[in-house]
């Protein structure tokens, strides 16, 4: 068209994909009557009539815009709905009277890309490659126009650098007219890049201005040769028997070499390979003192077959051996003395304590306990505790039972038992002594003996209550080679209404236990002593 070059620049209208573009015809009244206007789209310099206005009434022309155009603002504005990227072109309005004039509008279309998707090269990158290797790929889908990509490493933008950094970007047009951008970052990496954080950023424009979207940060597997191998022990600090100890090999290479852990045989001084779990960790559970020794790790690079050896590491599993007490089963006469000696070995300095088993009372701090002028109450348990003060929880104990020779000692001398005539009584009688006594009863019935511990016996008698029994009562006699002793059980008739807690009625029968709930006289509670005989 002659003189078109002198035409003013078109008015710019910016709109996002999917929204409505308002195309306002900027002809003044002098330039044309807006009640008689033709609208054209210009594509590749070809004009196509798309809409006509006559006497203020609009009419779409058949074609791609037929369904999306409408007249607004008393005919001065053409509304284009559902804008697509293909709508980015020049639209013009042409007035017919008084003379033909036109007004041009440049429609610009925008669409923000989706969040960038970054994929790291799963195969990783060797540090000694000759040229840049693929680090990661960034994809920005469905943007318009094509967004710009910037790659970052540790928060700093990466620039193209010959033989070091190369960014290769390409785009595809979707059927929608939107662009998908793919950018590949290639780089030569060094060992220090093993922890580097890479991400990509998409820069794009919208009618509201410039915007950007960032991908997540990724690290790329970087492969570099091992230079050093070492051992790590968990937990750190002092180890003790019973702990779970893990010995693992570590290397500064990636991938790590094939590890083997060996322990020096103290006899042959040869390194002997230990069996590790699937993760190459040597687990000592529970750790024992035999696990102490010199460990080392060998790392074998299966590609180069180069083998590296760690510095040896001394492992010390602290222990306390079984505690030995001598004499182990002391027997003493009343009035005599006894020296108990406690021994144990340890990898650390030991502290010894003697406790009375029944009360927990500390009797002595040290390995030797001296007991003088022994009374029979001194019989029973004494516990030696060997502990390592510098390692909490590392201790061993040994119980020794002191047996004091003596005739039987009854749990009670006499006791009243409430009974009913014709009930079956369950009587019990307890005695202690060394040697362990046997118990007999002065009445016929079913008796059974239970060894409570080696110095204590409990006899149970089932007997029917008869008038004769009520008159005589029941005696139990405990005897050993050193003498005998008797307990008397007095039987008292009780009315049904005055049953005491000592007797209970079950299906017409009553059982009454004559042994006390607490042995007022006895120190044989909770004893663990060797036992003498019961006659077989």
């Amino acid at each position: 068209v002659p003189g078109e070059a002198e035409q003013p620049a078109p008015e710019l209208v910016e709109v996002e994909v999917g929204s409505t573009a308002l195309l306002k015809c900027g002809l003044s009244q002098s330039q044309g009557n807006l009640s008689h206007v033709d609208w054209f789209s210009v594509h590749k310099e070809k004009r196509t009539l798309i809409f006509r206005v006559r006497q203020g009434q609009g009419q779409s022309e058949p074609g791609e815009y037929e369904q999306r155009l409408s007249l607004q603002d008393r005919g001065a504005t053409l509304a284009l709905t559902q804008v697509t990227p293909q709508d980015e072109r020049i639209f013009l309005c042409q007035g017919k009277r008084p003379r033909s004039q036109e007004y041009r509008i440049q429609l610009r279309v925008y669409k923000a890309p989706e969040e960038p998707n970054i994929q790291v090269n799963p195969l990783g990158i060797p540090v000694n490659s000759k040229e840049p290797e693929e680090v990661a790929t960034c994809v920005g889908r469905n943007g318009y126009p094509i967004p710009q990509v910037i790659w970052y490493k540790n928060g700093r933008p990466l620039k193209e650098e010959k033989n070091r950094v190369h960014i290769q970007s390409s785009q595809t047009v979707e059927s929608s007219g939107l662009y998908t951008l793919q950018s590949i970052l290639k780089a030569q990496l060094v060992k220090e890049d093993k922890d580097a954080q890479f991400y990509c950023e998409l820069n794009y424009r919208l009618p509201s201005g410039n915007h950007m979207k960032e991908s997540r940060e990724v690290t790329v597997p970087v492969f570099y040769p091992t230079e050093k191998v070492w051992l790590e022990v968990e937990p750190v600090g002092m180890l003790k028997e019973g702990d779970r100890v893990e010995i693992r090999c570590l290397a500064d290479g990636n991938p790590p070499p094939h590890f083997s852990i060996s322990k020096q045989n103290p006899s042959t001084r040869e390194a002997e390979e230990e069996t590790t779990n699937d993760n190459g960790v040597l687990v000592l559970e529970p750790a024992r003192k035999e696990h102490s020794g010199r460990y080392e790790c060998q790392g074998l690079d299966l590609d180069t077959m180069i083998s590296l050896l760690s510095e040896p590491q001394e492992l010390l599993v602290n222990y306390v051996s079984d505690v030995r007490v001598s004499p182990a089963a002391p027997e003493r006469q009343e009035g005599s003395s006894l020296t108990l000696t406690c021994e144990a070995e340890s990898s650390q300095d030991l502290e010894f304590q003697w406790l009375r088993e029944e009360t927990g009372q500390v009797l002595e701090r040290g390995p030797v306990l001296q007991l003088h002028d022994l009374k029979r109450e001194a019989g029973g348990g004494y516990r030696c505790v060997a502990s390592v003060p510098s390692i909490p929880g590392l201790n061993r104990t040994q119980l020794v039972n002191v047996a004091i020779f003596g005739p039987p000692w009854m749990a009670f001398k006499e006791r009243k038992v409430w009974v009913k005539e014709n009930m079956v009584l369950n009587l019990s009688c307890e005695a202690s002594g060394h040697p362990r006594p046997t118990i007999s009863w002065n009445v016929n019935g079913t008796a059974s003996e239970q060894d409570q511990d080696p110095q204590r016996v409990l006899s149970t008698l089932n007997v029917l209550v008869t008038p004769e029994l009520l008159e005589t009562g029941v005696e139990c006699t405990a005897s050993n080679d050193l003498g005998k002793n008797t307990s008397i059980l007095f039987l008292e008739l009780v009315n049904l209404t005055t049953l005491t807690p000592d007797s209970n009625t079950t299906t017409g029968l009553s059982t009454s236990t004559a042994s006390p709930h607490t042995r007022a006289n006895s120190t044989s509670t909770e004893r663990k002593l060797p036992e003498p005989e019961s006659r077989g």
Epitope: A329, D481, L529, E531
Partner: antibody, heavy 118, light 111 residues
Framework: QVQLVESGGGVVQPGRSLRLSCAAS????????IHWVKQAPGKGLEWVAR????????YYNEKFKGRFTISRDNSKNTLYLQMNSLRAEDTAVYYC???????????WGAGTMVTVSS | DIQMTQSPSSLSASVGDRVTITCRAS??????????MHWYQQKPGKAPKLLIY???NLESGVPARFSGSGSGTDFTLTISSLQPEDFATYYC?????????FGQGTKLEIK
């Protein structure tokens, strides 16, 4: 030192009697149990009897009850085993041995040999 | 009576060997963690000598290579490293009840 010494063994005819002695020294005789243990030639050990010298209480292996009697003389710190109606199967070494109240034998005499033969 | 069965009846071993002798009682000889089982060594023409008392306690003066273990009915005497002077006959004995009985003996001979 603690010692037990047996004596009284020898050759005896079946049906006759023999008294074995066991002299104790080096410990308080009345505070321990003294036992007799039999060992027939090439055979194992067999417990015969025990006495507590402090109270004179005795126990026997049923196998020897009635023919054998254990006794003591505290003034001499000596233990005895009276063996009556001897039989060929009584031929053995007889040991005396000491125990406490747990009945393990911590001190033994050297033994005395009894041979019953016609 | 409680029967005591020792095994083996005899065994041949060499100096330095680890040797185990077992003894089984016909009923339990243990009470409250204490076991009335004892072990003796006897050499030809000599009296028996106490080695282990109450199943696991080493008698004073007995070398530490001797050890005992077990409870209930099953017991073991172990010699960790045989010495020339250990070739002898070994007996177990219970004292759980009367009558006390011994095992039949295990004769340990030089291979």
């Amino acid at each position: 030192q603690v010692q037990l010494v047996e004596s009284g063994g020898g050759v005896v005819q079946p049906g006759r009697s023999l008294r074995l002695s066991c002299a104790a020294s080096g410990f308080t005789f009345s505070n321990y149990w003294i036992h007799w243990v039999k060992q027939a030639p090439g055979k194992g050990l067999e417990w015969v009897a025990r006495i507590y010298p402090g109270t004179d209480i005795t126990y026997y292996n049923e196998k020897f009850k009635g023919r054998f009697t254990i006794s003591r003389d505290n003034s001499k710190n000596t233990l005895y085993l009276q063996m009556n109606s001897l039989r060929a199967e009584d031929t053995a070494v007889y040991y005396c041995a000491r125990s406490g109240g747990y009945w393990y034998f911590d001190v033994w005499g050297a033994g005395t040999m009894v041979t019953v033969s016609s | 009576d409680i029967q005591m069965t020792q095994s083996p009846s005899s065994l041949s071993a060499s100096v330095g060997d680890r040797v185990t002798i077992t003894c089984r009682a016909s009923k339990s000889v243990s009470i409250s963690g204490y076991s009335y089982m004892h072990w003796y060594q006897q050499k030809p023409g000599k009296a028996p000598k106490l080695l282990i008392y109450l199943a696991s306690n080493l008698e004073s003066g007995v070398p530490a290579r001797f050890s005992g273990s077990g409870s209930g009915t099953d017991f073991t005497l172990t010699i960790s490293s045989l010495q020339p002077e250990d070739f002898a006959t070994y007996y177990c004995q219970h004292s759980r009840e009367l009558p006390y009985t011994f095992g039949q003996g295990t004769k340990l001979e030089i291979k």
